[in-house]
Interface confidence: low
Amino acid sequence: DTHKSEVAHRFKDLGEEHFKGLVLVAFSQYLQQCPFEEHVKLVNEVTEFAKTCVADESAENCDKSLHTLFGDKLCTVATLRETYGEMADCCAKQEPERNECFLQHKDDNPNLPPLVRPEVDVMCTAFHDNEATFLKKYLYEVARRHPYFYAPELLFFAARYKAAFAECCQAADKAACLLPKLDELRDEGKASSAKQRLKCASLQKFGDRAFKAWAVARLSQKFPKAEFAEVSKLVTDLTKVHTECCHGDLLECADDRADLAKYMCENQDSISSKLKECCDKPLLEKSHCLAEVENDEMPADLPSLAADYVESKDVCKNYAEAKDVFLGMFLYEYARRHPDYSVMLLLRLAKAYEATLEKCCAAADPHECYAKVFDEFQPLVEEPQNLVKQNCELFEQLGEYKFQNALLVRYTKKVPQVSTPTLVEVSRNLGKVGAKCCKLPEAKRMPCAEDYLSVVLNRLCVLHEKTPVSEKVTKCCTESLVNRRPCFSALELDEAYVPKAFNAETFTFHADMCTLSEKEKQVKKQTALVELVKHKPKATKEQLKGVMDNFAAFVEKCCKADDKEACFAEEGPKFVAASQAALA
């Protein structure tokens, strides 16, 4: 399937609007500090060039690879050295090294200001004045903050963003209409970014075998009526799509994703009865819908797994003949029977089964050796079940904010070397598992909770890799993808940690505290809590609760005072002294 001009091929396949959007996303994810206007200029130049290639595929430079064309364009940015430092050295390289160099410099935590939402009237005016620029700005701002955001999905978010403004800027109460929609898009966008980051980490750090295993388990849960061969085909195609997007090959990724959606909709009968409503939708919505589709009903007559995978005398023969296929079939069969298990648990079970066969198929009596293999699964299944049960009980008892605080204390004691902002961000997100999953019926709790925790802990791993400070974190992040969460759960208080010296500055607060939003106030308090634990890692729950209650009372008192700043100046040192005494 070779084309004289790759850029013309993708332009024709994707259409001008999607082509321009994806190129803007690609450039914004690579050069995260560049101003918007610079990116728009580059995108327009690439688009004009693509059009000349569509008109004549033999025109000069039209036969160049997309990496060559895009890299050449990025390297024309005048301020590359001043803005990006050593990233400018990438431009001295030839392809494919140059593109690899750009990828290496993607920053998961770019030093960019938080996005401030203007007044609704201001946004509506901007939307009406120049809709195209308004939407491009959205793509640019999201892409530069989330350099691994799944690009075709970002186009879907932009379409929803546009629809929200088109509807709400006409409404009687613009704010009431628009703000909840923007909040929903923001929260869904952050979740989508984090999920995709785990997919890219899985591919980049653990190889395509790890990603394929994840995909076999997840797609087998979603499509339990599909044959193994059908699931395998979908897994192969999905792996290609995500490998491309994680490599920055966004045009190919979007094109292949559209092809996969087309294939699924043309083959619904052999995949799932749940696809029908997705397949009537336009492309972006259809692909999103297929990715999020609910699990199909399990076939009623599925036989016991034991016959083929334990009782059969041919287990070792089948395993030896084609190990990965046999293990893939085992994972498929187990996953389609267990929508109530997390994908990570299913992968642990497959790993345990593989380890048993490796040991037993070399034994004198293999069948005798592996006869009890399913019994060995029990503790692996019970561990996440108990974890979910205990944490949901704690969440229901404490509520979200205090549950987050419990996790903050727990994780700071485990890995006190990690930076305070990272501990606050990760623990706040870990704490959101309660509201997200604990209200669900029993059969959906574990897949919701453990697979969400895997996404959040990946964020910790990604941030920690940029600035490694803890051997424990490195160990949990790198040794096994499927055992990351149990590895972190098993960590205890770090006895080797030397407590941080007390710094009064960390616990000095000012009147600006009173004008913060509720969320910002929580973050301030949680930052103080982490610093307290770093100072006194062996403090008891009761001691910490006492200090935090005093803190809340002190802030409330000063925010009600006539002279707020004077109150903070006077009461602050008293609070610090009382806290030190309470933790002594």
Epitope: P96, E97, G207, R209, H247, D324
Partner: nanobody
Framework: QVQLVESGGGLVQPGGSLRLSCAAS????????MSWVRQAPGKGFEWVSS????????RYSDSVKGRFTISRDNARNTLYLQMNSLKPEDTAVYYC?????????SGQGTQVTVSS
Amino acid sequence: QVQLVESGGGLVQPGGSLRLSCAASGFTFRGFGMSWVRQAPGKGFEWVSSINSGGEDTRYSDSVKGRFTISRDNARNTLYLQMNSLKPEDTAVYYCAIGGAGATPSGQGTQVTVSS
């Protein structure tokens, strides 16, 4: 299209040395950890060694530790395996693969035979 082409194998006497190379193309080599795995006649795949994307973190199976050295040249998109003090039990087809210890080979491999 992801391509991994292994080379450098051959017949060598016990105690001898070989250097295997793996030329990678079609993906962002610099951004990925890489591994060597091997398959002895009639056996399954056995992980040999891994190296992270930057090249500073290397891991080895107990059977080759101290004898084999994994390295990479990101500028040349190439992965290497220096094999010293070879033993007859090192006889296998050697494959390079994208990722860590669980990586799946996709190339043709290169045959290493250790025999007197």
